[in-house]
């Protein structure tokens, strides 16, 4: 019987010879659970596992803890891969995180973190980041040190308010912090002075809601 080949991430897919962008099935080692992820095989050498994408407002990102845990949306379009999968993956080896951003004026920028991982669900999928470079700000728009993940039904932020309800979307909110890539999607010419938009403060400033975002990870030794 032919052995089934499985891939833990898009870097393994790439190294196996599949070098075309698209949706691939990923499976963690010692697991039977599969997830569908979009693989970017072109940008910066390829092998990137897309863990979040916003592009047109077609998917509702005001979701529950469980939905953010297991993932939602369409891997070919807007989606969230899932905190549990990303947590397990990023605790097995060292990963880098690249966040690619687009504004409504045709500009693009990125933030690259040389080390990224999420804590377990017991620790509320707290984000850990180190070593920022890139063009989307010299200061991290994800608050440092990293915060716990919060959703509309799980308030783990540092605010007297409930950030996820106030800003919408699940995120590593502080109180509430300089970013929220899972906020409300606003169309062009309606994207400024927004209290709950798609925010990356140290690139576009306050109240500016972005046109597009992609969060992608890849092993540091790729």
């Amino acid at each position: 019987k032919e052995e089934q080949i499985s891939f833990r991430d898009c870097a393994e897919v790439f190294k196996s010879g599949h070098t075309t962008n698209g949706v691939y099935t990923l499976t963690l080692p010692n697991s039977t659970e599969e997830v569908k992820a979009y693989c970017d095989m072109e940008a910066g050498g390829g092998g990137w596992t897309i863990i979040q994408r916003r592009e047109d407002g077609s998917v509702d990102f005001q979701r529950t803890w469980k939905e953010y845990k297991v993932g939602f949306g369409n891997p070919s379009g807007e989606y969230w891969l899932g905190n549990e999968f990303v947590s397990q993956l990023t605790n097995q080896q060292r990963y880098v995180l690249k966040i690619h951003l687009k504004d409504w004026e045709g500009n693009e920028a990125y933030s690259l973190y040389e080390h990224f991982y999420l804590s377990s669900e017991e620790l509320n999928y707290r984000i850990h980041l180190k070593g920022l470079t890139g063009t989307a700000g010299k200061i991290s728009s994800i608050s440092q040190p990293g915060n716990d993940f919060s959703t509309k039904d799980a308030d783990n932020d540092k605010c007297i308010c409930k950030c996820s309800q106030m800003l919408t979307g699940g995120w590593w909110f502080d109180a509430c912090g300089p970013s929220n890539l899972n906020g409300m999607y606003y169309p062009q010419r309606q994207n400024t002075n927004k209290f709950n938009g798609i925010k990356w403060y140290y690139w576009k400033g306050s109240g500016y809601s972005l046109k597009g975002t992609t969060m992608m990870i890849r092993p540091a030794d790729f």
């Epitope: 540092k158 605010c159 007297i160 308010c161 106030m166 109180a175 509430c176 306050s206």
Partner: nanobody, 129 residues
């Protein structure tokens, strides 16, 4: 649509006074804090004063304490900054900005700059003889 419109800037001699207004629309002041900020040429934007809770809580930067007074008229959805004893170093573009009042860190009284998501276009204040 959220809008903030500043007015009242102008040229004034050292020691003089001005009153700036910030008219808000698209939301009510009851649930928001309003901050005044200023930016001089070649310098970072800095916080000057802020108000929330219908005037129950106010903040002033050390550089303007005793000279500037912030107030609000919720019936007009407008916040004012009365500036007395003006100095040349007060010359700057003055902006007002809004943040949901509840967006406060536990134990803190005021808000980092990045929490203010709605901004006006600014009004120029020039203090010169």
């Amino acid at each position: 649509e959220v809008q903030l419109v500043e007015s009242g800037g102008g040229l004034v001699q050292p020691g003089g006074s001005l009153r700036l207004s910030c008219a808000a629309s698209g939301f009510t002041l009851d649930d928001y804090a309003i901050g005044w900020f200023r930016q001089a040429p070649g310098k970072e934007r800095e916080g000057v004063s802020a108000i929330r809770d219908n005037g129950g809580s106010t903040y002033y930067a050390d550089s303007v304490k005793g000279r500037f007074t912030i107030s609000s008229d919720n019936s007009k959805n407008t916040v004012y900054l009365q500036m007395n004893s003006l100095r040349p170093e007060d010359t700057a573009v003055y902006y007002c900005a809004a943040v949901p009042a509840g967006r406060l860190r536990f134990g803190e009284q005021w808000y980092p700059l990045y929490e203010y998501d709605a901004w006006g276009q600014g009004t120029l204040v020039t203090v010169s003889s």
